[in-house]
């Protein structure tokens, strides 16, 4: 079988060679070939070349479309880890440390406080805040965690909020709040997490984190 295949290949190769040689002879205007024959062979050859070029163009287009699609919709995702802060601010601090995610420069962590996006679209935004508090040591007000948004030219606004009453456990009882939702973000929009008492937030591995994902 293999031998027959080889003979077939050689025969095809010989035919191709004869065909190319004939085109060459047509081009040099050899008298032994009729004009009609030459025209037929030339148009056949032009057809082959056209097909090859069209195929090349199509492949090029497909590839460039794939690239464009990839460029237009790159994965945008971030997951950052809580960072203890000496600042008295109620806005939680985050860091790119541990098992964090920062997909590309289309999302950035700015001033350690906010995740800022460069592209408009729908994003799933989430935060988990673990805190340790005691009823006696804390004020009457509950512990509140807020997921907030600041868009260019607009006031800060609360997107999501959750409240937990303080524990009676001593010295303090651990509790976790999880916030998550889908929101339309504009280019340059920043999201951040605000809490009533940042000193009660737990910064142990996996307890407090914040992130987003473009849908």
């Amino acid at each position: 079988h293999r031998r027959l295949d080889k003979i077939e290949d050689e025969r095809n190769l010989h035919e191709d060679f004869v065909f190319m040689k004939t085109i060459q002879r047509c081009n040099t205007g050899e008298r032994s070939l009729s004009l009609l024959n030459c025209e037929e062979i030339k148009s056949q050859f032009e057809g082959f070349v056209k097909d090859i070029m069209l195929n090349k163009e199509e492949t090029k287009k497909e590839n460039s479309f794939e690239m464009q699609k990839g460029d237009q919709n790159p994965q945008i995702a971030a997951h950052v880890i809580s960072e203890a802060s000496s600042k008295t601010t109620s806005v939680l601090q985050w860091a790119e440390k541990g098992y964090y995610t920062m997909s590309n420069n289309l999302v950035t962590l700015e001033n350690g406080k906010q995740l800022t996006v460069k592209r408009q679209g729908l994003y799933y935004i989430y935060a988990q805040v673990t805190f340790c508090s005691n009823r006696e040591a804390s004020s009457q007000a509950p512990f509140i965690a807020s997921l907030c948004l600041k868009s260019p030219g607009r006031f800060e606004r609360i997107l999501l909020r959750a409240a937990n009453t303080h524990s009676s456990a001593k010295p303090c009882g651990q509790q976790s709040i999880h916030l998550g939702g889908v929101f339309e973000l504009q280019p340059g929009a920043s999201v951040f997490v605000n809490v009533t008492d940042p000193s009660q937030v737990s910064h142990g591995t996996g307890f407090t984190s914040f992130g987003l994902l473009k849908l």
């Epitope: 601010t89 906010q114 600041k150 607009r154 006031f155 800060e156 920043s190 951040f192």
Partner: nanobody, 129 residues
Framework: DVQLVESGGGLVQPGGSLRLSCAAS????????MAWFRQAPGKEREFVAA????????DYADSVKGRFTISRDNSKTTLYLQMNSLRPEDTAVYYC??????????????????????WGQGTLVTVSS
Amino acid sequence: DVQLVESGGGLVQPGGSLRLSCAASGRTPLNYHMAWFRQAPGKEREFVAAISSLLGSTDYADSVKGRFTISRDNSKTTLYLQMNSLRPEDTAVYYCAARETTHISTSDRVNEIRNYDYWGQGTLVTVSS
């Protein structure tokens, strides 16, 4: 209530600099969005710059971008406006404004006068040679 008092205005030559201050008293505006507006003679009051209450994010009018800087002190009781490369068209009375975070309105744009709850009396800035 919150009282806002501006200071630092005066006469300055074109290309010069000036720093305005706005002191807040009363219910200290720990969670207030603060802004500067200005009103030139015979013109409407216009937005200059704003700073957000929690993040301290800033927004500027196109006419002052790159020349003016809004900031506040750590206690959030004093607001500043650093004005550089001043031009004659910057001549106006400059007002400090504050908005409570609980303020409810149909618009959330920082450059709209109606979105602010408290106003100072203003300080005059004259840019002339």
